[in-house]
Every structure is written in structure tokens, then in C-alpha cells.
Interface confidence: low
């Protein structure tokens, strides 16, 4: 650290006198100090000396000695005052700028330490100072106004009480600037319009800011609109409105309605679109598949988006059967809005029973007319089967029944033992059945097949298996010939009931 | 928001004082910008005077100087508003009202007191 | 100080119909900032004084869009676009530029 020579805190001198300050470090050395006249600089290696021999008010302040080459930035100080009978204050600054909330130092420097017990900060033309505010004094640096405000944006003198009287400093303007964080802040409302030709319309653009200097216009295609302006002033932040009223709006007017506002931080812009239409409109679509298939028990969510003006006058969910003549509960059915315009129509159908398959349809109305979207539901189940020995046409036959949506594969085994399922090791032939008689198959219905298997001759010893699958699942049916005659086994695992 | 409640009417006779307060609720005293104005029968609003931010002190209307006097108790956060040598026309409803410190219209307004100046 | 001139001191008024008060000031009260320090208050009968219109144009919260303010300098306007019977009353201009505060006589609008 440099060592300053003299070597105390503060040097109190008369104006005229010879001042020497020496500064001695390991490396070279720098002084730093208040810009003021008369001082000479000579510097030689490791030491720099400052002197005078005529100091004035104006030499005092304090002077820092700094070592450029040392890592650590050590410095040394010494603070000088040239005390003047005449001149109690050296100001080193005459405009001090800060931003609301910081400390503002207003440097008017006291000549004399003996004067600091009778200083005071005032106002020019003697006024006092504005209330709220909070300021210290250092005799070395001057008076500090704490968190300044806007308001206190003044003029302002330092006051030393000298023989009974009290001696200004010449004035220090203090500009206090708000603090401004970015562009104004913008609102553009609607953020969607639409109107059919004739109808009236309105579009408001506003834009706020701490600081009164901003500028907001609102341009519609690009070109920037003459709109009369209103000002207000909330919560300590001025706003400026553009209210673009249209009596009766045509398609000249569609299009892009941009809301834009500047100030020294920068631009903001938001924007919107203005669609005129011929007239009143009602639009009905589903994301999902109008024809939906889910498995019996299981849930399902019917959606759809509406995108209507003017609003909604009316509008339901309705089942049309086939099979009863209930309707959807209200309270699965839900409307959310998406936005001014669009709107989603959710009907919730959990747990799904076999009497709930069939048409749902929606239906919604606006001046523009009604709409209807329908949605067909089937239900899918796993197969249902069951097998009986009967004689076709003179010869033995199994005829399976297989019942379930989609419609089911059949696959007949023969195995060995009696067994209500025939496993891999007792297989002793396959037979699939590409082509099962259809026997029913009506919509929303399950599809029933039939298969038969021809058997000249039923071994007493085996089983027939009729298998049915499809992609719900799968189920079957054993036969198993006793003498007494044959005896047909469900396995117990396959008996379903919805 | 700011609420200004103002003392009751008086009836005094020429020459003596009068003192009406004013308490405000909403805000302290000391973030606001105190005025009083005064309204005589049939006529129109009058300033009187009150505290300037600006000046850091309280201005008076050229006409009520040296006879009024107008003091903040911010314990309070009531402000006096005290007119001394009363006359027959000093008669009047007498309002207080604020402004902010970085604003000058007054808003709200005190309901108003009545003064009666008569022998 | 400055001086504030209203006119008319007398506006008979059809509901419905629209209705304008001038206030001129003896100085301009166009301050550095760009705002005109003007006010407006309406003064209902057997009511204190409410604000209206400051700074010239802006409309105090709360106060119906039916109203505004209009002028710059020294010659400004108060404007009811449709007067209703509610705005019955006495209006005020005020400068609010410098101390003392100084208002203008009041215009005192009645029904016909």
C-alpha cells in the first residue's frame, strides 16, 4: 500500500500557503484528486510528489494516492482543506443526476472543519427544503440526499454558519430522473374482433409509463391512425388512450390494428386482427373421428369446437338413440371458452353400458342459424360363445355361436383328454374358419358369427374347443362327448357379463 | 383511498377565533399536500391557502395573511386550519382538500364546516 | 397572481342536449412537462366541491365519458356531450400552475 507523507488523515492550511503531498509505493505511483489549480506534479520512480505554493479554496478535497501495478489496489488518502474566511465551500460539481431512489451527493465541500457543527442544506432563494427529505453531511464529500425522490428535482445551496451569519455555496442543480425499466407498457382490447358489415365496433389501445415523455399511436395496416388522445395519471404512472370508434364498420376496415408506444428505453408493439363478415356465421368441427369406437366400461370424451358470431343463442347435447330414450345428464356437459370467438363443448360419458352406444349429436344456434355435429359411438366387447352338437343334413356337426364387436375370428381345436381348454401339448388338430356365417350385424350392435364343424365320428376321449378372438379379447367354449351323450364346458374365466 | 372528515359548524362572534380540523384517513398526512378553501353564501370557491411540496412550506392567499394559520398534527394525521380577528364576512363553509406531493388537484374534498360570524 | 375568467356565469340546459363552459386564464398555464395545469370541479347542490377534469383533458377516475376538457395556454373548455339531469350544478375551473391557487367565478348549470 502506497504511504502518503505527511503522513495524517487531514491538513488544514491557509490560502497562500505551500502545500507538499509525497506518495512513495513499491511501484509507481498515481494521484487522484478534485480538479483544481495551481498544483504541480513530479514524479520520479517509485514516489510522486504534488505541491503548491499558492493553495486556494479550490485545492481542497481529497487526494488519493494509487499504485497501478499492485494487484491488490491498495491506496492511501489525505484530505486537505485550504480554509478560506471568505469561501466556506469548494463545489465540485454545479449538476448533480441521479435516478429516483438512489443517494444523490451534492459535492460542495466544507473549507474549514471547524464550520461543519453550523452547516445546513437549503433551497435556493433561502427556501427550505421539501419534507420527506433525508440527507446527511460529510465535511469531506458534502451533502448526501438519501433515496431521492422526482419531486425533489431542485436547486439547492449549502449553508455554512461563519461569524453568526450564514455563507452559501454557489447552487447545485439536482436532476432526480424516474426510473424508467424498459418501453411503456401496452394493452390492445379486443385481441380478436369480428363484426358483420354495418355493425358498430370499437379498438382500444393504451399504453402506460412512470414518465410522462412517451408517445402511443395505434396503425391499422400499416398506416398509423389520427385518433384524439386522453391522458391520465393512476397510481403514480401516466397512461394515454386511443379509442378508435367505427359506427358501422365495412371490409375496408378489416385487417391488422397494431398498438404501438416508445419512449427512450425503447418500442412496444401488440397487435390484433379486425375480420368483417358478410354476415352472422356458425361453424361446428371435432379434432376427434365423428365415428368413435371405445370398449364397454371404459370412458369416453366427446369434444367440439364451435367458432361462432354473434355468440351462442342456444345449445345441447342430444342422444338419438338406438337404444332408449335417455339423454345425456347436464352435468357432463361442459363449455369452456377459448376465446371470444371459439368455444369447446365437452360431453363426458364414463363407464360406458351397452345401452349407451348410438348417435350423440350436438346442436348450437346463433343468428346465422342452427348447426348439428353427430358423433356415431359403437362399443366394442370381447366374444361371447357357446357350442351345441346338433345334425345337419344328416351329419354330425358342432355349431359355435360367437357374439362381440369387432366381429370375431373363430379357430375350432381338438385335443386330447377331457379339459375345459385345450393347451399346446394336448392339441391334436387346428382348424381356423376364415369365413364365419354372419348371423347378426347391426350398428351399434354386437356382431354375431357362426361356424360349423363337421364330425363323422366324436372321439369319447377328446375335447372340441371352439375359440373365438378379436381385439378386445377372447373367449371360448369346450365340448367334451360322454357317452350318455355330449357335454359342452365355458370355461369359467370366459363367462362375461357387461 | 384518502377520506377527509372535518369538524362541526361554529358560531363565533367578530373578533374572536375560530379552529377547524381535519383528519385524514387512507394516507399519512405527511404524503399528502393539505389546502383549504372557502366558500361564502352564494358565492363562489376561494383559496386560501395550504402546503406547497414544491416550496416545502405552507403559502397563504395574499388576503388571509397574518390572520390565518394552518398547522399539521402528523401524530394525528390531522390538519388546523385557524382564522383569528373573524369579520361578518367570514361567514362561509370552510373545505379542506388534499393533493399529492407530485400532483396539484385536489381530490377528495372535507364535507365542509360551517363558520358563523355574528354579534 | 393569476386570473381565471368563466363564461357564462348562467347555462340553462335541455337533457339530452350538449353544453360547453370556457374558462380563460390571464397567463398561459402550459407548464415545461407539455401539461396545462387546469382543473374543473362540479359543486352539486348542497354538495362540496368534486373533481372532474385535470391537467386540461384528463377525466377523473370514475367520471362519465359525457364529459371533457379541452383548450391549451390560456383558453379552455369543459363539454357535456349529452347533459343529464344529475350534472346540475356550479363548475369550477382552477389554475393550477402557481401559488395561489385562483379559481374562476363558476358557471352555474340549470336545467330549462
Known amino acids: 500500500i502506497p504511504v502518503i507523507e505527511p503522513s495524517v488523515p487531514e491538513l488544514v492550511v491557509k490560502p497562500g500557503a505551500t502545500v507538499t503531498l509525497r506518495c512513495v509505493g513499491n511501484g509507481s505511483v498515481e494521484w487522484d484528486g478534485p480538479p483544481s489549480p495551481h498544483w504541480t506534479l513530479y514524479s520520479d520512480g517509485s514516489s510522486s510528489i504534488l505541491s503548491t505554493n499558492n493553495a486556494t479554496f479550490q485545492n481542497t478535497g481529497t487526494y488519493r494516492c494509487t499504485e497501478p501495478g499492485d494487484p491488490l489496489g491498495g491506496s492511501a488518502a489525505i484530505h486537505l482543506y485550504v480554509k478560506d474566511p471568505a469561501r466556506p465551500w469548494n463545489v465540485l460539481a454545479q449538476e448533480v443526476v441521479v435516478f429516483e431512489d438512489q443517494d444523490a451527493l451534492l459535492p460542495c465541500l466544507l473549507t474549514d472543519p471547524v464550520l461543519e457543527a453550523g452547516v445546513s442544506l437549503v433551497r435556493v432563494r433561502g427556501r427550505p427544503l421539501m419534507r420527506h427529505t433525508n440527507y446527511s453531511f460529510s465535511p469531506w464529500h458534502g451533502f448526501t440526499i438519501h433515496r431521492a425522490k422526482f419531486i425533489q428535482s431542485q436547486d439547492y445551496q449549502c449553508s455554512a454558519l461563519m461569524g453568526g451569519r450564514k455563507v452559501m455555496s454557489i447552487s447545485i442543480r439536482l436532476k432526480v430522473q424516474k426510473v424508467i425499466p424498459g418501453p411503456p407498457a401496452l394493452t390492445l382490447v379486443p385481441a380478436e374482433l369480428v363484426r358483420i358489415r354495418g355493425e358498430a365496433a370499437q379498438i382500444v389501445c393504451s399504453a402506460s409509463s412512470v414518465d410522462v415523455n412517451f408517445d402511443v399511436f395505434l396503425q391499422h395496416n400499416n398506416t398509423k391512425l389520427a385518433i384524439p388522445q386522453q391522458s391520465d395519471f393512476h397510481n403514480n404512472r401516466y397512461q394515454k388512450v386511443l379509442t378508435l370508434n367505427l359506427d358501422q364498420v365495412d371490409f375496408q376496415h378489416a385487417g391488422n390494428y397494431s398498438c404501438v408506444a416508445s419512449n427512450v428505453q425503447g418500442k412496444h408493439s401488440t397487435s390484433m386482427f379486425f375480420r368483417v363478415v358478410e354476415s352472422a356465421y356458425l361453424n361446428l368441427s371435432s379434432e376427434q373421428n365423428l365415428i368413435q369406437e371405445v370398449t364397454v366400461g371404459e370412458g369416453l370424451n366427446l369434444k367440439v369446437m364451435v367458432e361462432a358470431y354473434p355468440g351462442l343463442q342456444g345449445f345441447n347435447w342430444t342422444y338419438l338413440g338406438p337404444f332408449s330414450d335417455h339423454q345425456p345428464e347436464p352435468k357432463l356437459a361442459n363449455a369452456t371458452t377459448k376465446d371470444t370467438y371459439r368455444h369447446t363443448f365437452t360431453l363426458s360419458l364414463p363407464r360406458l353400458k351397452p345401452s349407451e352406444a348410438g348417435r350423440y349429436s350436438f346442436l348450437a344456434r346463433n343468428p346465422g342459424g342452427w348447426r348439428a355435429l353427430t358423433f356415431e359411438l359403437t362399443l366394442r366387447y370381447p366374444p361371447e360363445v357357446s357350442v351345441i352338437w346338433t345334425f345337419i343334413n344328416g351329419s354330425g356337426t358342432l355349431l359355435c355361436a360367437a357374439s362381440g364387436y369387432p366381429q370375431p375370428n373363430v379357430t375350432w381345436l381338438q385335443c386330447s383328454g377331457h379339459t375345459d381348454r385345450c393347451d399346446e401339448a394336448q392339441v391334436l388338430q387346428v382348424w381356423d374358419d376364415p369365413y364365419p356365417e354372419v348371423l347378426s350385424q347391426e350398428p351399434f350392435h354386437k356382431v354375431t358369427v357362426q361356424s360349423l364343424l363337421t364330425v363323422e365320428t366324436l372321439e369319447h376321449n377328446q375335447t372340441y374347443e371352439c375359440r373365438a378372438h378379436n381385439s378386445v379379447g377372447s373367449g371360448s367354449w369346450a365340448f367334451i362327448p360322454i357317452s350318455a351323450g355330449a357335454h359342452t364346458h365355458p370355461p369359467d374365466e370366459f363367462l362375461f357379463t357387461p | 383511498q384518502v377520506q377527509l372528515v372535518q369538524s362541526g359548524a361554529e358560531v363565533k362572534k367578530p373578533g374572536a377565533s375560530v379552529k377547524v380540523s381535519c383528519k385524514v384517513s387512507g394516507y399519512t398526512l405527511t404524503e399528502l399536500s393539505m389546502h383549504w378553501v372557502r366558500q361564502a353564501p352564494g358565492k363562489g370557491l376561494e383559496w386560501m391557502g395550504g402546503f406547497d411540496p414544491e416550496d416545502g412550506e405552507t403559502i397563504y392567499a395574499q388576503k388571509f395573511q397574518g390572520r390565518v394559520t394552518m398547522t399539521e398534527d402528523t401524530s394525528t394525521d390531522t390538519a388546523y386550519m385557524e382564522l383569528s380577528s373573524l369579520r361578518s364576512e367570514d361567514t362561509a363553509v370552510y373545505y379542506c382538500?388534499?393533493?399529492?406531493?407530485?400532483?396539484?388537484?385536489?381530490?377528495?374534498w372535507g364535507q365542509g364546516t360551517l363558520v358563523t360570524v355574528s354579534s | 397572481d393569476i386570473v381565471m375568467t368563466q363564461s357564462p356565469l348562467s347555462l340553462p340546459v335541455t337533457p339530452g342536449e350538449p353544453a360547453s363552459i370556457s374558462c380563460r386564464s390571464s397567463q398561459s398555464l402550459l407548464h415545461s412537462n407539455g401539461y396545462n395545469y387546469l382543473d374543473w370541479y362540479l359543486q352539486k347542490p348542497g354538495q362540496s366541491p368534486q373533481f372532474l377534469i385535470y391537467l386540461g383533458s384528463i377525466r377523473a377516475s370514475g367520471v362519465p365519458d359525457r364529459f371533457s376538457g379541452s383548450g391549451s395556454g390560456t383558453d379552455f373548455a369543459l363539454t357535456i356531450s349529452r347533459v343529464e339531469a344529475e350534472d346540475v350544478g356550479v363548475y369550477y375551473c382552477?389554475?393550477?400552475?402557481?401559488?395561489?391557487?385562483?379559481f374562476g367565478q363558476g358557471t352555474k348549470v340549470e336545467i330549462k
Open positions: 382538500a388534499t393533493a399529492g406531493l407530485e400532483i396539484r388537484w385536489f381530490d377528495p
Open positions: 382552477m389554475q393550477a400552475l402557481q401559488t395561489p391557487r385562483t
